[in-house]
């Protein structure tokens, strides 16, 4: 009878032991991840984390759709609303190159760096060629008129265009559109100023930054935080806290990201910081993921998001700061009339593109959205998307603007652009994080359900033989 | 050397003409658009007349409108002034200067126009 | 038209003297103002455009401010060169027009 008893008590033992032990994993293998994450996901030279800020190994597109203007006569001697179409995809490939002039700062753990542009186009993932026309705003001619409305300089910008056979639109190629191209209004002025003129002009051979960002040492819930952009703290565009550069670049966060929080990000490409919500939990080749979009709140006039009321800058367009969807960011464009919109004016008021017909805004093409691995902070995929419009106003002294009766803010294109973690990449983390985490959590379920269920088992054995013996 | 020179001054009996010239050196004035402004014996300064670049347009004073006229012959990088039915208040020295930004960045040494009987 | 109103019409001061002249728009100019300095029987100089700007070769002692309808030319130390007659113009509408001009004196 004791050897049977023996047996029972031992097998309940080594259960309660198995069940405690399975317990105990449960902290100290979530100590044992934390520990490994907060080590590789530092900003120094060894970590995973590292090499893969240095130099992406995700293949980064940058999408564009070009708004061909179908009526630029009308419209110029009409103000008739401006029909466009778009076209598009004209694919590149950017962000290619490695970060440059990488600098750490032992004394504030910091590091800082460039990150260089450049953008090779990919015929295979595109439409047409660089070299297809469009008709588009003439982006000389607006951005003048805005930058100069003393009337006296417009009568002399106005004998330039006219010299130069300018007019309110103008055809030119993908590339000169894009990358620039001389201006034959422009090349008149008398004075040294740039002639050349492109929607990103200067982009290839250019370099963003100097960032400098946390690099986790100290604290590694501020990794990957900007501490400062081009040596400042803020961005000199807007008003109060609007002004402040929040957050990381959007690639990284610090890891262990929850649900509830609110993702605070600066973008350079809109001149400001923004940030983006949960959404939904996605699963990306084999890797759990939460997918943060940026919401329609972010997009909203002061009227409707009290937060957004540095965000207006001027009152007249904006009729009154009641407008919403779009971004005034002149000022960081050197005064031209630069306004920044999701594409197809998605979350922006009907007053916006009431003067534009040929616009399908949707959300599944036209929001942005960031995937990110909880645990390591990473963005695994995104996709940014953005609308890049121009304004042009009537003007009584400039002859191709003279018969306009109102304000457009002109689509001129948008883009997407998009990264996803490659599927080697994707393997490779799956066995590196996932795999290892997921294989730690069945081992300590493996262990507690095993051990409760032999102790159960064997104390309940041990209990009926007991009382049968009693018996 | 970026030069403006003055000619044709005088004097002109009320209700007379005279063409001033204003010869131009290193630069186009074709470029810039050339104006006309007069100071009166003791007086301050008067803008009169602008030719905009490439001759788009031609700007006056109220004081002189219809009986001065600008012009520019940009084969000999000269401009001009026509002035007709002259009054003595016309008297000045009249300066052309150049600009394009609106103000006058580079000036003649003048030339005196004298109405009187 | 817009009217510039400059001043004092003219001012005495010593050499080494902060000298300050105003000069008012008649309506809102921006900052499209120049300043120049005219010597007896010589043609105007430029000084500043655009209300701030200091034109190329002109001494540092010179300065503007102001936008708007309200502007000012300093000479933070007055130079024996200086004693002149000064304007102020208007560059942000056709017709360009002046003011009647300050006269500074020796004291």
């Known amino acids: 009878g004791c050897d049977r008893n023996c047996g029972l008590i031992t097998g309940a033992v080594i259960g309660a032991v198995l069940a405690v032990f399975g317990g105990i994993l449960m902290p100290v293998g979530d100590m044992l991840i934390q520990k490994t994450i907060k080590k590789e996901v530092v900003l120094e030279e060894g970590t995973i984390a590292f090499k893969n800020w240095v130099k992406t190994g995700t293949e980064i597109y940058r999408q564009f759709w070009i708004f061909d203007v179908q009526n630029p006569q009308e419209v110029m001697m009409n103000s008739s609303n401006i029909q466009v179409k778009q076209r598009g995809p004209y694919t590149y490939r950017v962000r290619f190159l490695a970060k440059e002039n990488i600098t750490q700062d032992p004394k504030d753990n910091t590091v800082s760096f460039l990150q260089p542009n450049g953008a090779i186009f990919e015929p295979s993932l595109s439409v047409g060629t660089e070299a297809d026309n469009f008709t588009v705003l003439n982006l000389a001619v607006a951005a003048a008129s805005h930058i100069y409305p003393n009337p006296f300089v417009q009568v002399v910008l106005n004998s330039l265009i006219n010299k130069s056979k300018s007019s309110m639109f103008q055809v030119r190629t993908l590339r000169e559109l894009l990358w620039g191209y001389t201006d034959p209004f422009l090349s008149l002025v008398p004075y040294p100023v740039s002639t050349r003129v492109g929607m990103f002009y200067p982009y290839n051979n250019t370099a963003d930054g100097v960032y400098k960002v946390f690099n986790g040492k100290d604290s590694i819930s501020k990794v990957a935080i900007i501490d400062t952009y081009k040596g400042k703290r803020n961005l000199s565009y807007w008003e109060s806290y609007c002004d402040m550069i929040n957050g990381t670049d959007a690639a990284s966060f610090p890891p262990f990201v929850e649900k509830s929080q609110v993702l605070q990000f600066f973008s350079s490409d809109i001149c400001r910081s923004i940030y983006a919500v949960f959404e939904s939990d996605v699963n990306l080749k084999g890797i759990p993921v939460y997918r943060f979009v940026l919401p329609s709140k972010a997009f909203a006039s002061p009227v409707q998001n009290p937060d957004n009321h540095c965000f207006c800058t001027e009152k007249i367009i904006s009729k009154n700061c009641t407008s919403y969807g779009v971004l005034d960011i002149s000022k960081c464009k050197e005064g031209k009339p630069v306004y920044i919109s999701l594409p197809h004016f998605l979350y922006a008021s009907p007053d916006v593109s009431e003067t534009i017909d040929g616009l399908n805004p949707n959300e599944e093409e036209h929001r942005t959205y960031l995937d990110i691995e909880p645990i390591t902070g990473f963005t695994l995929q995104f996709a940014k998307r953005l609308q890049v419009n121009l304004l042009v106003k009537p003007s009584n002294k400039i002859q191709v603007l003279k018969r306009l009766k109102r304000n457009y803010i002109v689509p001129i294109l948008w883009l997407n652009e998009t990264g996803t973690i490659g599927d080697e990449k994707a393997k490779m983390f799956r066995s590196q994080v996932t795999g290892k985490i997921n294989l730690l959590g069945l081992i300590e379920m493996i262990l507690l359900s095993v051990g409760v269920v032999m102790f159960v088992a064997f104390m309940i054995s041990y209990c009926a033989c007991r009382s049968k013996t009693i018996k | 050397e970026v030069q403006l020179v003055e000619s044709g001054g005088g004097l002109v009996q009320p209700g007379g003409s005279l063409r001033l010239s204003c010869a131009a050196s290193g630069f186009t004035i074709s470029s810039f658009g050339i104006h006309w402004v007069r100071q009166a014996p003791g007086k301050g300064l008067e803008w009169v007349a602008w030719?905009?670049?490439?001759?788009?347009?031609?700007y006056y004073a109220d004081s002189v409108k219809g009986r001065f006229t600008i012009s520019a012959d940009t084969s000999k990088n000269t401009a001009y002034l026509q002035m007709n039915s002259l009054r003595a208040e016309d008297t000045a020295v009249y300066y052309c200067?150049?600009?394009?930004?609106?103000?006058?960045?580079?000036w003649g040494q003048g030339t005196l126009v004298t109405v009187s009987s | 038209d817009i009217q510039m109103t400059q001043s004092p019409s003219s001012l005495s001061a010593s050499v080494g003297d902060r000298v300050t002249i105003t000069c008012r728009a008649s309506?809102?100019?921006?900052?499209?103002v120049a300043w120049y300095q005219q010597k007896p029987g010589k043609a105007p100089k430029l000084l500043i455009s655009?209300?701030?700007s200091l034109y190329s070769g002109v001494p540092s002692r010179f300065s503007g401010s102001g936008s708007g309808t309200d502007f000012t030319l300093t000479i933070s130390s007055l130079q024996p060169e200086d004693f002149a007659t000064y304007y102020c113009q208007q560059h942000s509408n056709a017709p360009l027009t002046f003011g009647q001009g300050t006269k500074v004196e020796i004291k």
């Open positions: 030719i905009a670049p490439y001759g788009g347009e031609e």
């Open positions: 309506q809102d100019v921006s900052n499209w």
């Open positions: 200067a150049r600009s394009f930004f609106g103000y006058f960045d580079y």
């Open positions: 655009y209300a701030t």
